[in-house]
């Protein structure tokens, strides 16, 4: 009798672990839920002020065309400017027409004056190609000014209104480039 | 927190060809931009190649014209297509992904465990 009390005891013990078990797991999972739910209603909210504002390019960045541009300010080498620029979901400037550079160069004259500004272009260390960061190559009359020496990587920069090509590891502004929202109204 | 899935590392002879590919756990929408970096041993990390959520891409220049990025957004999936491969081309090949900010709030980018690539004969 004692034995089958014990055994009880024992089964009911057993199944209060589960039980517990099984809340914790619950607790966890709706605390998951929680999380996520916060990140969707603020991703959601997000997404519906930048909706409401309807603006086609973010804040302090300026449009052309089906373009957004952002010319920063600070300075930093080819490579991280790339970076910094993927990281506001663009890449740096890419030039296709001669109307785009004059755009670029009338503007920056207006913000900054003559600085130095990276844009996407870089040239192939074996072939000597000059190839736009999504690898198509630039239109004759959009090749950098051959100025540099460097035994180094070279990359293309803005300055003025010509483009012209420096070390990729020396510190420069850089201009990154998003497509502007198309409006569905 | 973010899972990226990685597949498709192995050993290729040079000349061949690789498939990565790496799932997200979250919509493709909720960063602004994904993509490929590698590091070879004693090398810095670099970008191989990268996509941002408007589409725009970006290749390393030693990759350039014999790599492919590609995304499915149904799948929340980035692809690389790795052709005409090259001994220097060996390193551990890492998903990245750059999360859009919420609310101002700025995060750190989310990185796979990476998947190794060798080029050899």
């Known amino acids: 009798k004692l034995l089958q009390v014990s055994t009880i005891a024992m089964q009911q013990q057993e199944k209060l672990i589960q039980q517990e078990r099984a809340l914790l797991n619950f607790t966890e999972w709706k605390r998951s839920c929680a999380l996520q739910m916060k990140y969707c209603q603020a991703f959601m909210q997000n997404s519906l002020s930048s909706a409401h504002n309807s603006s086609p390019c973010p804040n302090n960045w300026i449009q052309n065309r089906e373009s957004c541009y952002y010319v920063s300010e600070i300075w930093s080498i080819w490579h991280t400017s790339q970076e910094n620029c993927l990281k506001e979901g663009s890449t740096l400037l890419q030039i296709e027409s001669k109307e785009e550079m004059d755009f670029i160069t009338g503007s920056l004259r207006k913000i900054k004056g003559s600085y130095d500004y990276w844009v996407g272009l870089s040239q192939d260390g074996h072939s000597g190609r000059w190839l736009w960061q999504d690898g198509s190559s630039p239109s004759p009359g959009l090749l950098p000014a051959e100025r540099s020496q460097s035994a180094n990587q070279v990359c293309g920069y803005v300055k003025s209104n010509s483009l012209l090509s420096s070390n990729c590891s020396t510190w420069k502004y850089f201009i990154c480039e998003k497509y502007a929202l198309r409006s569905s109204v | 927190q973010v899972q990226l899935q990685e597949s498709g590392g192995g050993l290729v002879q040079p000349g061949g060809s690789l498939r990565l590919s790496c799932a997200a756990s979250?919509?493709?929408?909720?960063?602004?931009?994904m993509g490929w970096y590698r590091q070879a041993p004693g090398k810095q990390r670099e970008l191989v190649a990268a996509i941002t959520n408007g589409g725009r891409i970006a290749y390393g220049t030693s990759v350039m014209g014999r790599f492919t990025i590609s995304r499915d957004n149904a799948k929340n999936t980035v692809y690389l297509q790795m052709d005409s491969l090259k001994p220097e081309d060996t390193a551990v090949y890492y998903c990245n992904a750059k999360p859009a900010p919420v609310y101002g709030s700025t995060v750190g980018d989310y990185w796979g465990q990476g998947t190794q690539v060798t080029v050899s004969s």
């Open positions: 979250r919509s493709f929408f909720s960063f602004n931009a």
